[in-house]
């Protein structure tokens, strides 16, 4: 069983991956940002089913993709570089799904543009959190 | 820069084994499902095998099943398949693909396996 | 197992022209899983459509993807003389996949 401890580190790790993800949307959302139309574009592997901490291999999995939509912003909106972003939020995601050893990924029927993709994880993440509260 | 390397194809005897390998540079290796895809001479693709990023759950053709197996060993960045029993319609180009989603963003340039006596 | 049907079996066109590509499903397919690649002789296949209508990285904007269901298509609006090859849908969830037959690109 959980410990009180791990419980509240778990929440922390959420709490710091939330932050994150809202700050590439608002990044992104910016009225400024002139790339945003070319950057919605881009489609991203939605998850089928995202309830439990494992389902953030889904996230996983898309990060380098999100670098790489990130890398067209070029947005002085966003306090670390696409590179450093996506790799703080690796961290967090690698110590959050733990080893789970046996899940594969499955995918919603959509892909999903980089607004519905950073909105869906921050919904998972908002979730995940009230349960540990 | 995303790389895949295959190796160990090569001529066998019908009911032979072999060992394929592919290794992987570019990208965060333990991350990513990967697959093996084969192609016949002048034949089309058809998928072999696929192993989650953990390497825990495995997956396999109808074709190869019992026969086959994938793994891999994520502090080599490497995927296997190993053939054993192998037959005559085995003969292909073996390739590793990375998986984005459903779909293979990847591919090595493949090694070719041919059985025969 | 879902099969997937490519048509044609070859395409015989100019370079300029403007090349349509079909994939019927047996069954129906998520549009989040079909995807296209192309491949020229002595290569590995290349990514070119993900999400049935999604241009994979460096894919020029003459290749495009459609459909849903059972029917989707790859349209190529202009050939270009680098664009003759052979032609792959794709589709599955995850773990298990399965191709079309192919469909080749001829110059005519």
């Known amino acids: 069983a959980p410990t009180s401890s791990s419980t509240k580190k778990t929440q922390l790790q959420l709490e710091h991956l939330l932050l994150d993800l809202q700050m590439i949307l608002n990044g992104i959302n910016n009225y400024k940002n002139p790339k945003l139309t070319r950057m919605l574009t881009f489609k991203f592997y939605m998850p089928k089913k995202a309830t439990e901490l494992k389902h953030l291999q889904c996230l996983e999995e898309e990060l380098k993709p999100l670098e790489e939509v990130l890398n067209l912003a070029q947005s002085k909106n966003f306090h670390l570089r696409p590179r450093d972003l996506i790799s703080n939020i690796n961290v967090i995601v690698l110590e959050l799904k733990g080893s789970e050893t046996t899940f594969m990924c499955e995918y919603a029927d959509e892909t999903a543009t980089i607004v519905e993709f950073l909105n869906r994880w921050i919904t998972f993440c908002q979730s995940i959190i009230s349960t540990l509260t | 820069e995303v790389q895949l390397l295959e190796s160990g194809g090569g001529l066998v005897q019908p009911g032979g084994s072999l060992r394929l390998s592919c290794a992987a540079s570019?990208?965060?290796?333990?991350?990513?499902?990967m697959s093996w895809v084969r192609q016949a001479p002048g034949k089309g693709l058809e998928w072999v095998s696929a192993i989650n990023g953990s390497g825990g759950s495995t997956y396999y053709a109808d074709s190869v099943k019992g026969r086959f197996t994938i793994s891999r060993d994520n502090s080599k960045n490497t995927l296997y398949l190993q053939m054993n029993s192998l037959r005559a319609e085995d003969t292909a180009v073996y390739y590793c693909a990375k998986r984005r989603g459903p779909s293979f963003d990847y591919w090595g340039q493949g090694t070719l396996v041919t059985v025969s006596s | 197992e879902i099969v997937l049907t490519q048509s044609p079996g070859t395409l015989s066109l100019s370079p300029g022209e403007r090349a349509t590509l079909s994939c019927r499903a047996s069954?129906?397919?998520?549009?989040?899983?079909l995807a296209w690649y192309q491949q020229k002789p002595g290569q590995a296949p290349r990514l070119l459509i993900y999400g049935a209508s999604s241009r994979a990285t460096g894919i020029p904007d003459r290749f495009s993807g459609s459909g849903s269901g059972t029917d989707f298509t790859l349209t190529i609006s202009r050939l270009e003389p680098e664009d003759f090859a052979v032609y792959y849908c794709q589709q599955g969830p995850g773990g298990p996949a399965t191709f079309g037959q192919g469909t080749k690109v001829e110059i005519k």
């Open positions: 570019g990208f965060t290796f333990s991350s990513y499902a």
């Open positions: 069954q129906s397919v998520s549009s989040s899983y």
